[in-house]
Interface confidence: low
């Protein structure tokens, strides 16, 4: 069992003859007469298990002590330190022949943990180790003790484990602590990444490359990396992490924005306070909520304040000529705080006698410069049907009209288009022949441009070629043309007037009489 | 779902090329490296080596040095194998399988998708 | 390379019968070690990773123990779909060897 005893953050402990609860029970050849297991006691009445041996009346002494099997952990060099007290030859009398001050360290790597003898020529020498002039002075109880303390390291190492061996060849000493271990560079964090704990390389100038992981709420900006010393040291830290969209880093930790901030992008910079017209009630908001009745539109920055509709434009002149008009109005009182103000013409036809049932223009109506996006004040519309009831709104719009949900921002005007010629009449009908008379139909203009005052039907003899022709006017969208000429091709055109003129004819009707008395019923443009 | 998507059988003869892909999906292809792994008829798995998504660099394991590349098109998160001058030794099913190309703090690998194989048959 | 050994070739359990596969490393491979089920026809199944840790959606009558070069895969009851070939491969230094696989069947 061992206690704990507290190290460099770097570096991890294998073997701790310090910590060890009682003996620690080495193997020693030779078995008696050598090295020599002793309790003393520190200052603060603790034992220390100490391996001693002071052979130095007794020529060639070969006294060798091995440490129990030590796992390496996957570490590839470690390091050996040893305090010791070692006796000056000069101290002890009648000596000088038989007397060291140095003793040496082995190591043995094994896959085998239970290896029962010290086989000598299995050890490979780490070092001859000499007492130095830096020693500390230990006191316990009613001695100082003269501790020197040395250092070595041994790699690369391949095996699960290894074997320490200290050979003795005829010195004073006492070995008070040995202590085995290897170096990492502890787990640390370095710009928002975090490095886990990284065994240092197998040999004493190489550098482990490690990826670091960005901290609990951030993300990589440019690939972290830091290099893992051969000292346990972190060096040449590269690349970073960000803190995500809400959270701001705070004491090397990306902390969620505190209510009324918030932050959009992973980035460095600090939370934000929310913009004008907007306010966040949680933690870590990456946008803040617009007020009510405020909006922020699909491409506005988080950064922008919220922004409302337009109110409607104003002062809406309308000015008619025939069937155009032309409109114009001032900017709205109010743009809802945005500069994209734009304006949609919407034009509905209304019927004369119940203005409520309005219908949309349709196509055929004509905007310049176009009917929606305007971002001028002015459009003229043509293409208006004659004598019609048009009611035009103008709706001030802009990035964040669409979620509005009750638009109040338009304003809107009611003309009646002046009477026009009518259209041509697109269908006449032979409804029917006899010999001396055809019955005729058609129907109203498409756009009559005004009241139908009457219809003008000409006719005249194919062959005759419009030199003779004769004309019939009709009140109805039908007649009967009488006192023709039988087995005779008469042609036949329509057309309808208004107070503001007549229309144009309409295509021929071409339609041939009988010669005997019975009536051919047809309803062709083109009946024979 | 995260899956990996193999190229059909093939049969070739021997000298002839062939080439092997595996379409990724469900994920961010470039987080994870891609490994391919042999399995000869009625034999164990054999590890072939890997290539890095972020930068394109192939590892090939000793025995499949020479006659084998590792390639990747980012662009449609393929990667793919293509064995030259074949041999009737190399007739097996061959696996790509994905690893995290980071440890991202778990200091343990392992293959927790493989595609669903394609058998390569080199036959005169 | 680290050489993978997998014992037995193959184990004949009843079903409901616990089943204990071992794997040999060559070195300690510091529980660096996935434990892979292939059926018939199929590609592999990572069951094991890191020596004791449970995949995703895996049930728990699989577990896996060891250190050092000495690992186990322990199926506590075998049902009829845990006959199969089971396979473990370590991750401790390229190249990454699988075991050559136990079979298990049914006795």
């Known amino acids: 069992v061992t206690g704990s005893r507290v190290y460099p953050a770097n570096e991890v402990t294998l073997l701790d003859s310090r910590s060890v609860q009682g003996e620690l029970g080495w193997i020693a050849s030779p078995l008696e007469g050598g090295w020599e297991e002793v309790s003393i006691m520190d200052e603060k009445n603790t034992p220390i298990r100490t391996y001693q041996v002071c052979n130095v009346m007794e020529p060639s002494q070969n006294n060798w002590l091995r440490t129990d099997w030590i796992t390496r952990e996957g570490a590839q060099r470690v390091y050996i330190e040893i305090k010791f007290t070692l006796r000056d030859c000069n101290s002890l009398p009648g000596v000088m022949g038989t007397c060291k001050e140095t003793f040496n360290l082995y190591y043995y790597e094994s896959d085998n943990d239970k290896e029962r003898f010290i086989r000598e020529n299995q050890f490979v020498k780490i070092d001859t180790i000499a007492a130095d002039e830096s020693f500390t002075q230990v006191d316990i109880g009613d001695r100082i003790m003269k501790l020197n303390t040395e250092i070595r390291d041994v790699g690369p190492l391949s095996k699960k484990g290894f074997y320490l061996a200290f050979q003795d060849v005829g010195a004073c000493i006492a070995l008070v602590s040995v202590r085995v271990f290897y170096k990492k560079c502890p787990l640390t964090v370095r710009n928002l990444a975090q490095f886990p704990d990284t065994i240092t390389g197998a040999d004493t100038s190489s550098l482990v490359e490690v990826r670091g992981s960005c901290v609990n709420n951030s993300e990589e900006k440019d690939v972290p990396k830091m290099y893992c010393g051969a000292d346990g040291e972190w060096l040449v830290p590269i690349g970073n992490c960000l803190c995500n969209a809400g959270h701001e880093e705070r004491s090397g930790e990306c902390q969620a924005c505190k209510i009324g901030y918030y932050k959009a992008l992973s980035t460095d910079a600090t939370c934000a306070k929310c913009p004008p017209h907007s306010y966040s009630v949680w933690e870590g908001a990456t946008s803040c909520t617009c007020d009510r009745g405020f909006f922020r539109a699909d491409n506005d920055a988080a950064s922008m304040p919220c922004t409302r509709p337009p109110s409607a434009p104003l002062n809406l002149i309308s000015n008619v000529n025939e069937t155009s008009v032309n409109l114009e109005w001032s900017s709205p009182q109010n743009t809802g705080g945005r500069q994209d103000i734009s304006y949609n013409v919407v034009c509905k036809k209304c019927g004369a006698g119940d203005p409520s049932k309005c219908r949309p223009c349709g196509s055929g109506v004509h905007y310049t410069p176009q009917q929606n996006g305007l971002k001028t004040t002015k459009v003229s519309i043509t293409d208006l049907l004659a004598h019609t009831n048009y009611t035009f709104e103008i709706w001030a719009v802009n990035g964040v009209s669409k979620y509005n949900p009750n638009p109040d921002q338009s304003v809107s005007v009611t003309v009646t288009t002046n009477q026009a010629a009518p259209s041509s009449i697109a269908l006449v009908q032979a409804k029917e022949v006899t010999r001396y008379s055809v019955a005729l139909a058609w129907l109203e203009p498409d756009r009559p441009n005004g009241v139908i005052l009457e219809y003008e039907v000409k006719y005249y003899e194919k062959d005759q070629n419009e030199r003779s022709y004769r004309i019939v006017r009709t009140a109805a969208r039908n007649t009967d043309i009488k006192g023709l000429n039988p087995l005779t091709s008469y042609v036949f055109h329509v057309r309808a007037r208004t107070a503001a003129g007549y229309g144009d004819f309409s295509e021929p009707l071409e339609v041939t009489t009988n010669t005997v008395p019975s009536r051919i019923i047809g309803d062709g443009a083109n009946s024979t | 779902q995260v899956q990996l998507v193999q190229s059909g059988s093939e049969l070739k003869k021997p000298g002839a090329s062939v080439k092997v892909s595996c379409k990724a999906s469900g994920y961010t292809f470039t987080d994870y490296s891609m490994h391919w792994v042999r399995q000869a008829p009625g034999q164990g798995l054999k590890w072939m080596g890997w290539i890095n998504t972020e930068t394109g660099e192939p590892t090939y394991a000793d025995d499949f040095k020479g006659r084998f590349v590792f390639s990747l098109d980012t662009s449609v998160s393929t990667a793919y194998l293509q064995i030259s001058s074949l041999k009737a030794e190399d007739t097996a099913v061959y696996y790509c399988a994905r690893i995290p190309l980071y440890y991202y703090g778990s200091r343990y690998w392992y293959f927790d998708v493989w595609g669903q194989g394609t058998t390569v048959t080199v036959s005169s | 390379e680290i050489v993978m050994t997998q014992s037995p070739a193959t184990l004949s359990v009843s079903p409901g019968e616990r089943a204990t596969l071992s794997c040999r490393a060559s070195?300690?491979?510091?529980?660096?070690l996935a434990w892979y089920q292939q059926k018939p026809g199929q590609s592999p199944r990572l069951l094991i990773y890191?020596?004791?840790n449970l995949a995703d959606g895996i049930p728990a009558r699989f577990s896996g123990s060891g250190s050092g070069t000495e690992y186990t895969l322990t199926i506590s009851s075998l049902q009829s779909e845990d006959f199969a070939v089971y396979y473990c491969q370590h991750f401790w230094g390229t190249p990454w060897t699988f075991g050559q696989g136990t079979k298990v069947e049914i006795k």
């Open positions: 070195e300690n491979i510091y529980r660096n």
């Open positions: 890191a020596a004791t």
